[in-house]
Amino acid sequence: LTCLGGFASPGPVPPSTALRELIEELVNITQNQKAPLCNGSMVWSINLTAGMYCAALESLINVSGCSAIEKTQRMLSGFCPHKVSAGQFSSLHVRDTKIEVAQFVKDLLLHLKKLFREGQFN
């Protein structure tokens, strides 16, 4: 039993589960939104799809003091293979194009649902 005990220990979360949890978090944010999300802060829009998780994190990491998206930021960091810090600017972003955080989160939710349906979990 001691040897078998290892099988019960929590291992890495499967990508499909992590994506589903991220989608659920974004659903919570969009459904529970009363006042303007993050005081109407603006973030960079994203124009491409490869490397999207890192680009999304790069956009949202620049929003500080917004507890509503802190969990989303943490979850996105799990999908991004490199360290992301505020001020980074990816080629994936549409330069000079910013949108409201609420719209970004809503759009991200739409996109992640598509990826989930298509079986693209990473």
């Epitope: 829009s45 799809t49 949108i99 970004f104 809503k106 759009d107 991200l108 739409l110 649902k113 598509k114």
Partner: nanobody, 118 residues
């Protein structure tokens, strides 16, 4: 907020060509399926064409198949409709719109008028 701004409409002779553009702003254009819808004078809305978010899948109404080509440039947040071999029956206001099944993701432009007449 969200904006879709069509341009490129105008008067053209039968058999001529036009290229419509739709500049998107205020939302994550690259993640949306997009489309074109038209409304002829005194008629209802008619779906013309749509394209998936990747740009790899395109769909056309039978009435425009082989004459119209939809495309997109996600780096420019722009949707296009190349219209060739235009006919009088293509005369309409052409609207750019998102093409999503999900409720709450429905955005439309103001439209651009295309008139095909000699």
């Amino acid at each position: 907020g969200v904006q879709l701004l069509e341009s490129g409409g105008g008067l053209v002779q039968p058999g001529g060509s036009l290229r419509l553009s739709c500049a998107a702003s205020g939302f994550s254009f690259a993640w949306y399926d997009m489309g074109w819808v038209r409304q002829a004078p005194g008629k209802g809305l008619e779906w013309v064409s749509s394209i998936d978010w990747k740009g790899g899948k395109t769909y056309y109404a039978d009435s425009v198949k082989g004459r119209f080509t939809i495309s997109r440039d996600n780096s420019k947040n722009t949707l296009y409709l190349q219209m060739n071999s235009l006919r009088a029956e293509d005369t309409a206001v052409y609207y750019c719109a998102t093409a999503e099944d999900e409720p709450g993701y429905d955005y439309w432009g103001q439209g651009t008028l295309v008139t095909v007449s000699s």
